[in-house]
């Protein structure tokens, strides 16, 4: 369907592109000698960028540091030094720039303060960094300030002494609402969830922590859990891992009502050395990784039902190295239901897997057309594509970037990969899919940095090299043809590509430095592609595309999770602007139900290669370890439950006799007697 990529040659060359880009290339040289640069976008479609440069000299007793702050309001074409707005203070880079949610225009910078000071210091802006107010804090912050997603005036922070501090007026005044706090998170509706240690410390009390909730910013509290190891929020679910009574194992409990009632998740319990990890969550369901016992580096992915209680085994031997380690799990945001991850095979090599139906079935990635199988392949004609992600990067492979997809660039996935039986340690190439991962083509030879502009209308890439570079490549046809543009006559040591999050912009900033004998100078080049895409796209520039289409003859073609979607997509041959206001046009249509639209309810399972759910033999006639809402329950089921987010209608309805499964609640996680409310007086 798509040919091998070509660079320049006779490949749809764009007229006068060099002149057009030269007129739209803006250089900015930063007048400092900083060792590091961090960049943040402030707001959406505002064009405001903040750049913080830091220079640190570790002296014998203290370390001397200097920061500079720059601001652009034209997407990085010009920058103004605004260091004077923060009184030339040294900013602590480990806290980063805390940018407010949505388009609040709020920014918080945390300053370095001298050893004997009573508390920390922040600089706050609520006008997109035009002005800053210096505020001295009554505590030393341990973490970056966290904005409430619902109200950007509400902030929370943990202090170095484990106090939980809250501000209701964007950091002007602060109040300590609780001591001995280990972890705190904003929930919905300005709720704060946090764990507290009762006896010694967060580390010593792990597994004996209490989970608390405040719905009124610290006036009143409710203990919603005891014997807590950790907690997390995902989608509409609140999870807590809770220590068992009998031993050192722990189990996941789930709440969908902010901790008022809890149910025990039907997941394996884990021991001290193991972990749970929420890989992805939305309003419908959760992907949960459960680590294997022993230092195996892998575990099992389970997918939940709509309650977050019943879990189906999704993928075995899922690569996830030790707690807080590396996993390649990637949500392909450009197509619904698609995820890519890696498994660890028996021979300890690593293979990529993809699911198109939200974890229902996993398969290898199809071998790109016209590609050869590499040295990892036993059969030189049969192999698959393997994608490099976090694990490869952690293993120091020449992989400058993780896979990339954008919700508004429908179907496009870009990733480094190799073609064989397993992920290779050889130099990777860059591959692209234009159909959400069903088919792939080599896009660029060798490792590159890449980004998507104008909702997929332009793809930009820069070669990953340890030599200075001065060439940027771009494609207007989803990676089939590439043009090269020399953006400067003086090559720079490249450090990063920056474009506005959301992939709607037509500007790309190329960051790097020039180095002479003693000095290093930071420089950015911002290239605006607006004149390459001269006209706005019109109706004729778009074509209809059925997502997930694999068998056009079948009436169920394109049905995933009970419905199919037709998109209007830009033709590869159209060179025009989608524009900043582009909205993905899609037309959903409901599919008839089949057994594939149902998962097996608690106490049932699907035998290998079967579609019907049968009762688990080991559970027949037994009282089951099951706890719904913290009390004994009579659970009735017909063995099937609609897959979360599945919208099928009619068709097959797996009706069968409804069984009354008497379940015994074995969780004393939240005994009503243990629930108490407290006032902060």
């Amino acid at each position: 369907r798509r040919g091998a990529p070509a660079e320049d040659q006779d490949c749809g060359r764009l007229p006068d592109f060099i002149a057009k880009l030269t007129n739209n290339t803006h250089q900015h040289v930063f007048d400092d000698l900083s060792g590091s640069v961090s960049l943040s976008w402030v707001g959406d479609s505002t064009g405001v960028i903040l750049v913080l440069t830091t220079f640190q000299v570790p002296l014998v007793i203290v370390s001397f540091g200097q920061s500079k702050l720059y601001r652009s309001e034209d997407y990085g074409k010009n920058f103004k030094d605004i260091t004077n707005l923060i009184n030339n203070t040294f900013i602590r880079t480990e806290f980063g720039m805390a940018i407010g949610p949505e388009n609040s225009g709020k920014v918080i910078l945390t300053a370095e303060v001298s050893g004997g000071s009573r508390g920390g210091r922040v600089f706050r802006s609520s006008d997109f960094a035009k002005n800053f107010v210096q505020t001295d804090l009554p505590f030393h912050p341990l973490t970056q300030m966290m904005y409430s997603p619902q109200n950007s005036d509400y902030l929370l922070a943990l202090s170095t002494e484990n106090g939980l501090w809250v501000s209701k007026n964007f950091g002007e005044k602060w109040e300590e609402i609780h001591k001995a706090v280990c972890l705190a998170k904003w929930g919905p509706n300005n709720i704060i969830f946090f764990t507290t240690h009762v006896n010694g410390s967060c580390k010593a009390d792990l597994g004996a922590l209490e989970l608390w909730r405040t719905s009124d910013l610290g006036k009143t509290f409710k203990t919603i859990g005891v014997k807590i190891y950790s907690f997390g929020l995902g989608g509409r679910f609140l999870f807590a891992s809770v220590m068992a009574d009998k031993d050192t194992t722990r189990r996941i409990h789930v709440s969908t009502d902010q901790g008022d009632t809890w149910s025990m998740a039907q997941l394996p319990s884990v021991g001290q050395e193991q972990f749970y990890s929420i890989l992805a969550a939305n309003e419908d369901m959760v992907f949960m990784h459960v680590d294997e016992p022993g230092d195996t580096g892998f575990g099992t992915i389970f997918t939940s039902d709509d309650r977050g209680i019943v879990y189906s085994k999704s993928l075995d031997r899922h690569l996830y190295t030790t707690t807080g380690g590396e996993t390649d799990f990637t949500n392909v945001t450009s197509l619904r239901g698609v995820y890519i991850t890696s498994t660890l095979s028996e021979d300890n090599s690593i293979q990529s897997m993809i699911t198109f139906d939200q974890g229902g079935r996993w398969e290898h990635l199809r071998k790109p057309e016209n590609s050869k199988c590499d040295a990892t392949a036993k059969n030189k004609n049969e192999c698959s594509l393997h994608i490099h992600a976090s694990y490869s990067i952690s293993q120091k492979l020449n992989v400058p970037m993780a896979p990339l997809s954008e919700p508004n660039a429908v179907g496009i996935v870009i990733a480094h990969g190799s073609v064989g039986d397993a992920i290779s340690v050889m130099v990777p190439d860059v591959y692209i899919s234009d159909d959400g991962g069903y088919s792939w083509a080599k896009m660029l030879e060798g490792p590159h940095y890449y980004t998507i502009l104008d909702s997929g209308g332009i793809i930009v890439a820069i070669e990953h090299s340890n030599r200075p570079i001065n060439v940027i490549k771009f494609s207007t046809d989803e990676g089939q043809c590439w043009q090269s543009y020399v953006f400067t006559q003086e090559p720079i040591y490249f450090t990063g590509l920056a474009s506005e999050p959301g992939a709607r912009s037509m500007n790309i900033s190329i960051w790097g430095f020039t180095e002479s004998f003693i000095t290093r100078q930071w420089v950015s080049y911002t290239v605006d592609f607006k004149d390459i895409l001269e006209r706005n796209c019109e109706e004729d520039d778009y074509t209809t595309w059925l997502a997930h289409s694999t068998d056009p003859g079948d009436y169920k073609d394109g049905c995933i999770l009970g419905y199919k979607e037709q998109f209007l997509r830009l033709r590869k041959s159209s060179v025009c602007q989608n524009g900043r206001d582009y909205v993905v046009a899609k037309q959903p249509s409901v599919c008839p139900c089949s057994l594939e639209d149902f998962l097996c309810d608690f106490g049932y399972f699907r035998p290998e290669n079967a579609s019907e759910c049968v009762e688990q033999p080991e559970l027949k006639g037994h009282e089951l370890e099951f706890c719904l809402y913290g009390k004994e329950e009579h659970l009735t089921t017909n063995g099937y439950r609609k897959i979360p987010g599945d919208k099928c209608q009619g068709g097959m309805n797996p009706a069968r006799e409804v069984k009354d499964l008497k379940k015994k609640c074995t969780s004393n996680f939240l005994n009503p007697t243990k629930q108490n409310s407290k006032s902060n007086s």
Epitope: T296, G297, T321, V425
Partner: antibody
Framework: QVQLVQSGAEVKKPGASVKVSCKAS????????MHWVRQAPGQGLEWMGW????????NYAQKFQGRVTMTRDTSISTAYMELSRLRSDDTAVYYC???????????????WGQGTLVTVSS | EIVMTQSPATLSVSPGERATLSCRAS??????LAWYQQKPGQAPRLLIY???TRATGIPARFSGSGSGTEFTLTISSLQSEDFAVYYC?????????FGGGTKVEIK
Amino acid sequence: QVQLVQSGAEVKKPGASVKVSCKASGYTFTGYYMHWVRQAPGQGLEWMGWINPNSGGTNYAQKFQGRVTMTRDTSISTAYMELSRLRSDDTAVYYCARGGPQLRVAEYFQHWGQGTLVTVSS
Amino acid sequence: EIVMTQSPATLSVSPGERATLSCRASQSVSSNLAWYQQKPGQAPRLLIYGASTRATGIPARFSGSGSGTEFTLTISSLQSEDFAVYYCQQFRVLPPTFGGGTKVEIK
């Protein structure tokens, strides 16, 4: 065929550093990790770490962190292992060894250099 | 780290006889185990990987078995060139670790 040829024997004083080279031929040097393994006289084998010749990335065994540096020169397909602050118990034969083409959590070694004897003695 | 223990430390066998070498891991290494042969003054040579797969050019008299924590290398009929030290190595997790070796000597 794959060949790994190492530099000659070295005698060093305690506190000094030694740099052993390993020249690769017969395959694409940047396509495979290079590991270093040592063997003290009459003892077993001990893994020291790896270097990815392509990116220059390294991973050292805990025991050698801070003392070992692995580098490479891709233009001459050569990997280097430098061990500093030498002690008498660093006396050993040092081997370079090549892994396979797969990225693995840990590796076995298909091809070995002939070894370089490093003697640390005052 | 995973500790690999080989037994016996020395094995005396007559040429033409069968030799059985054992290797035990302190925790499961699945089938991620390799065997090497080393002769005096030489580098180790890969014999078996994946617990039971013979490396290229290795004679059929060498075979490996086992999984998890218990592994065996069998030399069905010892030839004169087989008298050497044999090492097992796990490649399940970092760091890769070797057993202390079994010396196979002429009886």
